[in-house]
């Protein structure tokens, strides 16, 4: 059977995730979970440095 | 060719235990999250939980109409994977099918059958 | 739990006629992260186990026949097989797994006239 990769690097994510399709990785707790248990990242105001909280690696296959 | 081949279905009754295995082939066991469904008799589909695969811990997530009563563990070495259902009710006698979880539920074994009944 | 509700729970249709199926889910299933819809449609004929036949709403499963497309975004999404084949005869379901636990339709009966 044909195993892709688990996820394509994206622009703004530093490393492929451990997670499989289905699920979201969790920056914050550093494990997979369901995608609806995150909050999508925010665009940041100008001249904020800081993340956004509980932002997801996970994009599109 | 991907294979899930559940078995150890039957009749128990009210109170008791048993062990449903899911024997997988085709693909490596290890790189994939594996879950359980079940389908009471002419009734919709339910969803009892999952196992993720080594690179996320083997960590579990159940539904809570279930949690406490059943434990979804795998022995990777046999490429099997376990559904221990404890204090079994009437209300637990379904179709049990294992299922690997990928994009969603990709690929379903054939099920297996448990009645729960005195 | 969010709850999905499928519509109609059965309908019967001639070989050739075009079908489609609702299922509406009780809060949105989109991840505006990567825009994907957290849903799935399985397709269970008689005595057979489910079968994967869409993912993400709307991306089909591979070796599953373009007549079966799905659709919608958020809370309401859809299943429509453009010309029906008699072995198209099935329950189908939808499911979230936009969040635990993953939840199911009560299922759509396709029967053949």
């Known amino acids: 059977m044909r195993r892709g990769p688990r996820s394509l690097r994206g622009r703004d994510a530093p490393a492929p995730t451990p997670c499989v399709p289905a699920e979201c990785f969790d920056l914050l707790v550093r494990h997979c979970v369901a995608c609806g248990l995150l909050r999508a990242p925010r665009p940041k105001p100008a001249g904020a440095s800081s993340p956004a909280p509980r932002t997801a690696l996970q994009p599109q296959e | 060719e991907v294979k899930l081949v559940e078995s150890g279905g039957g009749l128990v009754q009210p109170g008791g235990s048993l062990r449903l295995s899911c024997a997988i082939s085709g693909f490596t066991v290890t790189a994939y999250y594996m879950s359980w469904v079940r389908q009471p008799p002419g009734k919709a589909l339910e969803w009892l939980g999952f196992i993720r695969d080594k690179a996320n811990g083997y960590t579990t997530e159940y539904n809570p109409s279930v949690k406490g009563r059943f434990t979804i563990s795998r022995d990777n070495s046999q490429s099997i994977f376990y559904l221990q259902m404890n204090t079994l009710r009437a209300e637990d006698s379904a179709t049990y099918y294992c299922?690997?979880?990928?994009?969603?539920?990709?690929?379903w074994g054939q099920g297996t059958t448990v009645t729960v009944s005195a | 739990d969010i709850v999905m509700s499928q519509s109609p729970s059965s309908l019967a249709v001639s070989v050739g006629e075009k079908v489609t199926m609702s299922c509406k889910s009780s809060q949105s299933l989109l991840y505006s992260s990567n825009q994907n819809n957290y849903l799935a449609w399985y397709q269970q004929k008689p005595g057979q186990s489910p079968k994967l036949l869409i993912y993400?709403?709307?991306t089909r499963e591979s070796g599953v026949p373009d007549r079966f497309t799905g659709s919608g975004s958020g809370t309401d999404f859809t299943l429509t097989i453009s010309s029906v084949k008699a072995e198209d005869l099935a329950v189908y379901y939808c499911q979230q797994y936009y969040t635990y636990p993953y939840t199911f339709g009560g299922g759509t009966k396709l029967e053949i006239k």
């Open positions: 993400w709403a709307s």
């Open positions: 299922a690997q979880v990928r994009r969603a539920l990709d690929y």
